[in-house]
């Protein structure tokens, strides 16, 4: 159980079962496709929702890297393993007992292996670039207003701590929000930002898994900042291992 | 690691209250209730009431409902106990606990707690 | 409200002896899921009680195998195998199905 349960739904994942079976008849949700119980109170882990979401279709993508360790997920959806708090695990293996290593955000960073993969610890991404392409609008929008509705959104919806949030820059249609999170600046209860970006791509995409809210309705003093394209970049905090550039 | 820091001793004068804290560290505040337990001197535990910092709701048990009011102050991570018209039969020990996650199954249990705060009702 | 009791009171012991603490409900524990919240805690003088096992049988992060938990409904047992000194102090069960929740009176193990 925990908080903002209380009419028994879990407003920050709609993947999930609820019911009034734990102490005192409080409510407890569960993660689909795992059972694992989850923390209403704030963004669900993208190991759980990628698990809960397993039986979506694939969705790769390939894209054009900022840097030559940036990593993307051209894999597309897998059903991951996710530790007892919803991390991934750092080896992956599917049902043919091919395993490679992970990233944080679940993200693969090394060539595919078998069994004998060692994958020593789970790597950070402690840096994700998201670069959007807006819709044309009648003006460019002015840069703090995108700015400062951007922090907002990811303080507000998705509970991301503001120092997180390290830049947002804009070259109309362009808009790239940078996120960056070390492993020693990450406290106690606070978002990972690799989950913030996992909600905030449900939401541009209009598959947002927040129970009964709208979807994401983005405005810039009141003009709709609609997103057509969406690119998500990721750095880990020891770059990844593949044997030849991909 | 989890840290429950309650203050050591309360001194406090018949018919007046005392607010007792709880300051939570190394986990989620938000994410898990919080209990109080009392324990009377030479006597065994008895179950306060629980509150669940990220909305504030709260659950009593009947015995302490005019006696207790529990709050939480999010923004500080601290969970708070008022303790109203004060008598010798609350002289006592009190300790916040935190309550289990559904994650490792421990649902309904205590696994840490708070030091305890000794209040001595006297005039 | 739920009443426990816990037998025997006290509880004196050689180091080295295997014990059993019970723990009675005066209604059943396991809720219409299935669920039954009954956790055993450990309190020794001077400090803040400590949890032992939870949800009957499981045992908390840290706690020796030698501490094991049965029991279901209104019946519960807390089994220690080879006392050790650091064993010793209040044992309490407590129960977090229905409201108001309740402790047992406490079983205090002592050496003989």
């Known amino acids: 159980h925990t908080a903002a349960q209380d009419n028994c739904t879990c407003p920050t994942n709609k993947m999930t079962v609820c019911s009034p079976d734990g102490p005192g008849g409080r409510c407890q949700c569960r993660a689909l496709g795992s059972g694992v119980a989850v923390d209403c109170s704030t963004l669900t882990s993208e190991c759980l929702l990628l698990k809960a979401r397993m039986s979506a279709p694939k969705n790769a993508r390939t894209l054009v890297r900022p840097n030559e360790h940036a990593l993307v997920d051209n894999d597309g959806l897998y059903d991951p393993d996710c530790d007892p708090e919803g991390r991934f695990k750092a080896r992956q293996c599917n049902q043919t007992s091919v395993c490679w290593c992970v990233n944080s955000v679940g993200v693969r960073r090394t060539d595919k292996g078998d069994l004998s993969l060692r994958c020593d610890e789970l790597v950070r991404t402690h840096h994700i670039l998201i670069d959007l392409r807006h819709r044309p609008t009648a003006g460019a929008f002015n840069h703090s207003d995108l700015d400062a509705e951007l922090r907002r959104l990811f303080r507000e919806r998705y509970r991301l701590h503001p120092k997180f949030v390290a830049a947002v820059h804009y070259e109309q249609p362009t808009i790239q929000i940078e996120l960056r999170q070390n492993t020693s600046q990450k406290a106690a209860g606070d978002v990972d930002i690799g989950d913030a970006a996992y909600y905030f791509e449900r939401d541009v995409k209009g598959e947002s898994l927040f129970q009964g809210r709208g979807g994401l309705d983005l405005r810039v003093r009141g003009e709709p900042l609609q997103v057509e394209r969406t690119l998500i970049y990721y750095l880990d905090e020891i770059p990844p291992k593949f044997s030849m550039k991909r | 690691q989890v840290q429950l820091q309650q203050p050591g001793a309360e001194l406090v004068k018949p018919g007046s209250s005392v607010k007792l804290s709880c300051k939570a560290s190394?986990?989620?505040?938000?994410?898990?209730?919080m209990y109080w337990v009392k324990q009377r001197p030479g006597q065994g535990l008895e179950w306060i009431g629980e509150i669940n910092p990220s909305n504030g709701r709260t659950n009593y048990n009947e015995k302490f409902k005019s006696k207790a009011t529990l709050t939480v102050d999010k923004s500080s991570s601290t969970a708070y106990m008022q303790f109203s018209s004060l008598t010798s039969e609350d002289s006592a020990v009190y300790y916040c606990?935190?309550?289990?996650?559904?994650?490792?199954?421990?649902?309904?249990?205590?696994?840490?707690w708070g030091q305890g705060t000794s209040v001595t009702v006297s005039s | 409200d739920v009443v426990v009791t816990q037998t025997p009171l006290s509880l004196p012991v050689s180091f080295g002896d295997q014990v059993s603490i019970s723990c009675r409900s005066s209604?059943?524990?396991?809720?219409?899921?299935?669920?039954?919240?009954l956790s055993w805690y450990l309190h020794k003088p001077g400090q803040s009680p400590q949890l032992l096992l939870y949800g009957i049988s499981n045992r908390f992060s840290g706690v020796p195998d030698r501490f094991s938990g049965s029991g279901s409904g209104t019946d519960f047992t807390l089994k220690i195998n080879t006392i050790k000194p650091e064993d010793l102090g209040m044992y309490y069960c407590?129960?977090?199905?229905?409201?108001?929740?309740?402790f047992g009176g406490g079983t205090k193990l002592e050496i003989k």
């Open positions: 407590f129960q977090s199905t229905h409201q108001p929740y309740t």
């Open positions: 190394g986990y989620t505040f938000t994410s898990y209730w």
């Open positions: 606990t935190r309550e289990g996650h559904n994650y490792d199954g421990s649902l309904g249990a205590m696994d840490h």
């Open positions: 209604q059943s524990l396991t809720n219409s899921y299935g669920n039954t919240f």
